[in-house]
Interface confidence: low
């Protein structure tokens, strides 16, 4: 069957792109590096603006193999710092508490449910 617009906005597709390209600093070619940079910037902006983390939540960075995980030690960065609750200077309120998953210091909502709502209305 033909792919519908809805198929392109499935969480799995978002997840695959995020896991493969977010903070991937070891691409096979320059074109991929350009794409990776674009994906990283988009996700950073999304997570900061919408106060969300990953596609389904912070657990995305724990459950799946990702470029982010190969670039960052799990103990140092269980998830991107953009998942942390920020102050108005756009710096994590308390990085240690965010890393430890202390409620109130990191965003536990996934970004997909925030962006899929507006898309599903059209």
């Amino acid at each position: 069957t033909a792919a519908t617009q809805q198929d392109f906005f499935t969480p799995n597709l978002f997840l695959k792109q995020m896991l493969e390209r977010y903070q991937n600093n070891s691409p096979p070619n320059n074109d991929d590096q350009w794409k990776n940079n674009g994906v990283t910037k988009t996700w950073d902006r999304l997570m900061l603006q919408d106060n969300c983390c990953g596609v389904n939540g912070p657990s995305d960075w724990q459950k799946y193999t990702s470029a982010f995980r190969t670039e960052n030690n799990d103990a140092d960065y269980p998830w991107p710092r953009q998942c942390c609750v920020m102050n108005n200077l756009k710096e994590p309120l308390n990085l240690e508490a965010c890393k430890l998953g202390v409620p109130g210091f990191y965003h536990n909502q996934g970004c997909y449910e925030l962006i899929s709502g507006p898309m599903n209305r059209h």
């Epitope: 102050n87 108005n88 710096e91 994590p92 308390n94 240690e96």
Partner: antibody, heavy 123, light 107 residues
């Protein structure tokens, strides 16, 4: 145990210069933003200057009252914080505290304070 | 700049009392409010950060609350060693600013 020990205070004439030092120990100095906070005799506390860590390009910030006159700097290899004060005014008379920010990236809290060094600007 | 106002400059209380010190910001500071204790000898210590989080080593009789522009520090059971001046400070926006202080004395 976090320790911050200020030195370099003293009596100086208006328009004169003075350099304050702060020796830090008991923590990884190079990873923390550091601040100077002052208190004029019988008055409240006033934030003066802030310098971030190397990973944040040693970015500096100043209160308007000292901008272009004071310079904050640091020497990570010696765990030292400095405040170069030029063109001093009588209103700069105060106890100057060396202050370390708290853990994490919430820059707005001052977790550890030194005992202070007194600067008196008078003719 | 954000102005921090502590309307009560001095406060008298008895040992064992519950004491509340107030602080108001000139604009919403999103809970970025910290409290400090300054002893008569000039020693300054952080008590509470981000409105209500107790700094390490601070006795549990100290607590903080508030939101928006209005915040308070409470000492639930006043002890002799709590005699000091208490300052609030906003960490929301540079320049970081302090209240003028509330001096706590024994009745």
């Amino acid at each position: 145990e976090v320790q911050l020990v200020e030195s370099g205070g003293g009596l100086v004439q208006p328009k004169g210069s003075l350099k304050l030092s702060c020796a830090a120990s008991g923590f990884s100095f190079n990873t923390y933003a550091m601040n100077w906070v002052r208190q004029a005799p019988g008055k409240g506390l006033e934030w003066v200057a802030r310098i971030r860590s190397k990973s944040n390009n040693y970015a500096t910030y100043y209160a308007d009252s000292v901008k272009d006159r004071f310079t904050i700097s640091r020497d990570d290899s010696e765990s030292m914080l400095y405040l170069q004060m030029n063109n001093l005014k009588t209103e700069d008379t105060a106890m100057y505290y060396c202050v370390r920010q708290g853990d994490g990236y919430y820059v707005g809290w001052f977790a550890y304070w030194g005992q202070g060094t007194l600067v008196t600007v008078s003719a | 700049d954000i102005q921090m106002t502590q309307t009560t400059s001095s406060l008298s209380a008895s040992l064992g009392d519950r004491v509340t010190i107030s602080c108001r910001a000139s604009q919403d500071i999103s809970n970025y409010l910290n409290w400090y204790q300054q002893k008569p000898d000039g020693t300054v210590k952080l008590l509470i950060y981000y409105t209500s989080r107790l700094h390490s080593g601070v006795p549990s009789r100290f607590s903080g609350s508030g939101s928006g522009t209005d915040y308070s520090l409470t000492i639930s059971n006043l002890e002799q060693e709590d005699i000091a001046t208490y300052f609030c400070q906003q960490g929301n926006t540079l320049p970081f600013t302090f209240g003028s202080g509330t001096k706590l004395e024994i009745k």
